[in-house]
């Protein structure tokens, strides 16, 4: 079953290569288990950046080596992607799945265009 997912159109990563955005979903029921996947679309290729499964009220559960972190509040997921470089600029799509209880719902956002600008190296000072 389909579900609406909203996310910002554009986000600029900070100088440390960290970008944050909110992924909000319109839950048709009271889900206790939610899975969130961040996908990156660039040059018509789609790759999975990270994925998390969490319980309502719990912190997101990303793999330990993930570049993503996040927290949840109601039907909003606050996502942070770290370690970004200019080459990582692209469209980052939020996919939300309501895993339990049935019925299963899935929604995909329109994507957040994340722009990453590598910082200029500091000039040597004598």
């Amino acid at each position: 079953k389909a579900m609406h997912v909203a996310q910002p159109a554009v986000v600029l990563a900070n100088s440390r290569g960290t970008a944050s955005f909110v992924c909000e979903y319109a839950s048709p029921g009271k889900a206790t288990e939610v899975r969130v996947t961040v996908l990156r679309q660039a040059d018509s290729q789609v790759t999975e950046v990270c994925a998390a499964t969490y319980m309502m009220g719990n912190e997101l559960t990303f793999l330990d080596d993930s570049i993503c972190t996040g927290t949840s509040s109601g039907n909003q997921v606050n996502l942070t992607i770290q370690g970004l470089r200019a080459m990582d600029t692209g469209l980052y799509i939020c996919k939300v799945e309501l895993m339990y209880p049935p019925p299963y719902y899935m929604g995909i956002g329109n994507g957040t265009q994340i722009y990453v600008i590598d910082p200029e190296p500091c000039p040597d000072s004598d």
Partner: nanobody, 113 residues
């Protein structure tokens, strides 16, 4: 083979306490948010409590807040549920859950005088 084996259920009087355990094997326990669910006869399965991977974050269903405590020991691959001030309406089969992948077989808790 993935296994979640619950234990600790049984018959207890109202106001009494029980401690449920769930021994996990066959998967990386510390990588999972864990939870306890329960299902009373003729009712839908409901969430009782959940706990994050590290154990640093917990949440509870409204009906058990202040009475039940969920905890985990990642070194022992074990999930716990301490249940105090038990009531007749807590009677149910309690299931261990590795969110959102695996279920235990359940352990029956009966609260009756």
């Amino acid at each position: 083979e993935v296994q979640l084996l619950e234990s600790g259920g049984g018959l207890v009087q109202p106001g009494g306490s029980l401690r449920l355990s769930c021994a996990a094997s066959g998967f990386t326990f510390s990588s999972y948010t864990m939870a306890w669910y329960r299902q009373a006869p003729g009712k839908e399965r409901e969430v009782v409590a959940g706990i994050s991977r590290s154990g640093g974050t917990t949440n509870y269903g409204d009906s058990v807040k202040g009475r039940f405590t969920i905890s985990r020991d990642n070194s022992k691959n074990t999930l716990y549920l301490q249940m105090n001030s038990l009531r007749a309406e807590d009677t149910a089969v309690y299931y261990c859950r590795a969110v959102s992948d695996y279920w235990g077989q359940g352990t029956l808790v009966t609260v009756s005088s």
